[in-house]
Amino acid sequence: ISCGSPPPILNGRISYYSTPIAVGTVIRYSCSGTFRLIGEKSLLCITKDKVDGTWDKPAPKCEYFNKYSSCPEPIVPGGYKIRGSTPYRHGDSVTFACKTNFSMNGNKSVWCQANNMWGPTRLPTCVSVFPLECPALPMIHNGHHTSENVGSIAPGLSVTYSCESGYLLVGEKIINCLSSGKWSAVPPTCEE
């Protein structure tokens, strides 16, 4: 079982390999001096059906270095950074792990791209192994919230508060149900 030629990369190089490319072979990508690698640099030849070989992920890309690029602090609820620190410049990567009792969906690493956004995939998410729900939020005096149901709310959902005419909302307008089963903030109040 073997893999076909690894996907090419513009403005970069692929590590040496011999053919046929055996299952288990790793090839590594790197970029020319003025370019930055975005994505996983190592691809692995695997087989999913014990018949054909395939590369385990897409090739990374080489972006022309933008010295002005900088990315915001990436936040993964239920997770924490195991690699990477601010400031985040073009080509820098951040790797996440999930807290105990959370499992990861998506790719654990992201890269700061020339467009100041993390990529090439979305930030991973950490999902509770024991699906927790947030308790019902109370109604507030002289105001109301979007969730009229009295039951608990699933993580990832949010509740928006608003005040009646003539009243000012003090506190958070939108409160998110976190994967920990806790609300992101206490309910606001409506004051005259």
């Epitope: 590590s15 040496y16 299952v23 590594r28």
Partner: antibody, heavy 119, light 106 residues
Framework: QVQLVQSGAEVKKPGSSVKVSCKAS????????ISWVRQAPGQGLEWMGR????????NYAQKFQGRVTITADKSTSTAYMELSSLRSEDTAVYYC????????????WGQGTLVTVSS | EIVMTQSPATLSVSPGERATLSCRAG??????LAWYQQKPGQAPRLLIY???TRATGIPARFSGSGSGTEFTLTISSLQSEDFAVYYC????????FGQGTKLEIK
């Protein structure tokens, strides 16, 4: 940090086989590759082969092809290296070493297992 | 197999001085090179990877440089605990190690 604990020293006769184990604790066994590296007395390090436990894929250095078998038991987070048709030149300390994902370099090493081949 | 050659085989340096160890690859390996330290009776310990990135917990006096076929490990001010054998390892095409450089007290 991942801890790798290897089985104890072995004395073997020429022509026989030896099986060394390497138990990992900490981290996720499925997220890394385990290599076996040996070191003959007073000599340098020699890569023998490696396995990616989650895939069950093992690859071997040409020199050891056909004589070494590397396996892994995901349920016990243990990797094994079996070397057959032993000869005196196989007397060495055998190390297991871990690379995170498929990084290529070894963050963690076992304590080593001395295998002595003598008649 | 990519052949890795280290020089010198033995290097004698006084504590507090600078030590420079060399590693040459038989073909270009980009920056896919790691350095390890090994003391008698112990397993190797990762110092540097990707030619110049220090591993977690490695003191700043250790630095790596180079790309392609020529690489250097520099220890800026030798401490007593730095006297050991140092190995380079390539991971451009499978894996192979240099024969080692023994760093001894002058």
């Amino acid at each position: 940090q991942v801890q790798l604990v290897q089985s104890g020293a072995e004395v073997k006769k020429p022509g026989s086989s030896v099986k060394v184990s390497c138990k990992a604790s900490g981290g996720t066994f499925s997220s890394y590759a385990i290599s076996w590296v040996r070191q003959a007395p007073g000599q340098g390090l020699e890569w023998m082969g490696r396995i990616i436990p989650i895939l069950g894929i093992a690859n071997y250095a040409q020199k050891f092809q056909g004589r070494v078998t590397i396996t892994a038991d995901k349920s016990t987070s243990t990797a094994y290296m079996e070397l057959s048709s032993l000869r005196s030149e196989d007397t060495a300390v055998y190390y297991c070493a871990r690379e995170e994902d498929i990084s290529g370099y070894y963050q963690d090493w076992g304590q080593g297992t001395l295998v002595t081949v003598s008649s | 197999e990519i052949v890795m050659t280290q020089s010198p085989a033995t290097l004698s340096v006084s504590p507090g001085e600078r030590a420079t160890l060399s590693c040459r690859a038989g073909q270009s390996i980009s920056r896919y090179l790691a350095w390890y330290q090994q003391k008698p009776g112990q397993a190797p310990r990762l110092l540097i990877y990707d030619a110049s990135t220090r591993a977690t917990g490695i003191p700043a006096r250790f630095s790596g440089s180079g790309s392609g076929t020529e690489f250097t490990l520099t220890i800026s001010s030798l401490q007593s605990e730095d006297f050991a054998v140092y190995y380079c390892q390539q991971y451009e095409y499978w894996y192979s190690f240099g024969q080692g450089t023994k760093l001894e007290i002058k």
